[in-house]
Interface confidence: low
């Protein structure tokens, strides 16, 4: 199916930028892995590079504004032609859910006292309003609550006294049109406007003042322009060369508004001075190699020794990584393919242990399934032997750091009937539903 092709993918927002055009295939658009595409306007933007997880979204607002609730965040597998870690297809959402509490208590409404006395009328003649008030203290609201309804109410009042009305001008009417719209006619153009003493008219009993000034105004029409000339387009210029050496690019044609040039305020040419076309080099763009994550460390061994486990004997171990994705003469991966370090092996060594403090509460699991819970743990942590932290392997080559490696067998006193891990679980409260944010916008 044809897609909309863009020249940039903005990692921070996940939006496509720099529309190149539509009606091209995903495969053609993604000849350049820096490009991105949308299946429809306003739809999900997918970059052409290898799939990887987006940044986590910000945490959604707490599901309740008071007491303990829950909040969600998500990330999305974005990219083309492959899978994200965990063998996940592009477009897939992954969720996290955590407990939250915006405000410990919930508001409680208050009730009104009785109404107070009426205040005096707001005017000394004609009709006005008077007001009375009541207090929100019966009972008083708690935790940011309020009382239902209004704290004051008003009603009309009549002083039984007539007010005098002074005259005031209504707004000026419009200027009458000039007799000509361009200069150079037979008569000198004039314009006139008038106003009425009706906003309001002065009263007779009691007598009001008349409007000051004149009811009419006249002036000469000045600065009339010469009659305008509308602009017209010249012919399209030559098509510019394709500006890229691989993938898709954009060529341009230009024209000038000079056939004729607009004069005396005449309108500029309607339409665009440039038009663009997609050009296809049909050449794939180079793709640089990227290191995979490091592999596991190999077992800690020493040449010519069967085992160095549980002994103060330093050994060596290595780990490797693979350069992936290099295509079409892209750059090779920079840096080393192998990493070597010195180590002490504590694999399967019985070690004295001690119980850790409680860990922080974990995320709510499952984030989108029924009855999510969160957990925290205390672990039986091994006390590492006090072996020297650095060794000199070869005379004159200086000291090298030595790392403990392997899974020891820590021994702690039993805690709550457990020898290695004590776990505490709690349900997550007020859990919101997981919804695709792209679908929610539609």
């Amino acid at each position: 199916d044809p897609v909309l092709c863009f020249t940039q993918y903005e990692e921070s927002s996940g939006k496509c930028k720099g529309l190149l055009g539509g009606g091209v295939s995903v495969e053609d658009c993604c000849l350049n892995t820096a490009f991105a595409y949308q299946k429809r306007s306003g739809g999900l933007c997918q970059p052409c590079r290898s799939p990887r997880w987006s940044l986590w979204s910000t945490w959604a607002p707490c599901s309740v504004t008071c007491s303990e609730g829950s909040q969600l965040r998500y990330r999305r597998c974005v990219g083309w032609n492959g899978q994200c870690s965990g063998k996940v297809a592009p477009g897939t959402l992954e969720w996290q859910l955590q407990a939250c509490e915006d405000q410990q208590c919930c508001p409680e409404m208050g009730g009104w006292s009785g109404w107070g006395p009426w205040e005096p009328c707001s005017v000394t003649c004609s009709k006005g309003t008077r007001t009375r008030r009541r207090a929100c203290n019966h009972p008083a609201p708690k935790c940011g609550g309020h009382c239902p309804g209004q704290a004051q109410e008003s009603e009309a009042c009549d002083t039984q006294q007539v007010c005098p009305t002074h005259g005031a001008w209504a707004t000026w009417g419009p200027w009458t049109p000039c007799s000509a719209s361009c200069h150079g006619g037979p008569h000198e153009p004039k314009e006139t406007r008038s106003r009425k003493c009706s906003a309001p008219e002065p009263s007779q009993k009691p007598p009001g003042k008349p409007c000051p000034g004149l009811a009419y105004e006249q002036r000469r029409c000045t600065g009339l322009p010469p009659c305008p000339v509308a602009g017209g387009w010249g012919p399209w210029g030559p098509v510019s060369p394709c500006p890229v050496t691989c993938g898709l690019g954009q060529t341009m044609e230009q024209r000038t508004c000079n056939h004729p040039v607009p004069q005396h305020g005449g309108p500029f040419c309607a339409g665009d001075a440039t038009r663009t076309h997609i050009c296809n080099t049909a050449v794939p763009c180079p793709v640089d190699g990227e290191w995979d994550s490091w592999g596991e460390w190999s077992p800690c061994i020493r040449r010519n020794m069967k085992s160095i486990s549980c002994q103060e004997i330093p050994g060596q171990q290595s780990r490797g990584r693979t350069c992936r994705g290099r295509k079409f003469d892209g750059h090779r991966c920079a840096g080393q393919q192998q990493d070597i370090r010195h180590c002490y092996s504590i694999q399967h060594c019985p070690l004295k242990g001690s119980w850790s403090e409680w860990s922080t509460w974990g995320l709510c699991m499952p984030p989108c399934g029924p009855n999510p819970t969160r957990a925290r743990q205390r672990l039986c942590t091994p006390l590492l032997p006090k072996y020297p932290p650095t060794v000199s392997m070869v005379e004159g080559q200086g000291e090298k750091n030595v790392t403990f490696w392997g899974r020891p067998l820590p021994r702690c006193e039993e805690l709550q009937g457990q020898k290695l891990v004590v776990e505490e679980k709690r349900p997550c409260l007020h859990v919101p539903a997981c919804k695709d944010p792209e679908e929610e916008e539609l």
Partner: nanobody, 129 residues
Framework: QVQLVESGGGLVQPGGSLSLSCAAS????????MGWFRQAPGKEREWVAA????????YYADSIKGRFTLSRDNAENTVWLQLNSLKPEDTAVYYC??????????????????????WGQGTLVTVSG
């Protein structure tokens, strides 16, 4: 604006039962908490019971606990107060009232007459042998 009309009052013997109903007009009925008050001759108005907008929470005064039952049907815009094991001291005019609801709850809130925006005209209950 909500109009409230009580019905179901009358004369009953001690130990007998009555069912009072309060019919509300207006489409916003389901957004209000509903309460019942009573006023005996020569005495102050006394709170009896209240039910939140959804019916999830119901609160009763200590004097009637276990004898009176409050319920509502938002589809029918009606609240019922079932009076059982009636005593002569239950004789009073019974009033239905509507209060703004929301996050607000608790006996202290719903027992205060000042939080109720709309009141009915009342229905008389007489318990006499």
């Amino acid at each position: 604006q909500v109009q409230l009309v009580e019905s179901g009052g009358g004369l009953v013997q001690p130990g007998g039962s009555l069912s009072l109903s309060c019919a509300a007009s207006g489409r916003t009925f389901s957004s209000y908490a509903m309460g019942w008050f009573r006023q005996a001759p020569g005495k102050e108005r006394e709170w009896v019971a209240a039910i939140t907008w959804s019916g999830a929470n119901i609160y009763y005064a200590d004097s009637i606990k276990g004898r009176f039952t409050l319920s509502r049907d938002n589809a029918e815009n009606t609240v019922w107060l079932q009076l059982n094991s009636l005593k002569p001291e239950d004789t009073a005019v019974y009033y239905c009232a509507a209060a703004e609801s929301g996050r607000y709850s608790g006996r202290a809130y719903y027992s205060a007459p000042g939080v109720y925006l709309y009141w009915g005209q009342g229905t008389l209950v007489t318990v006499s042998g």
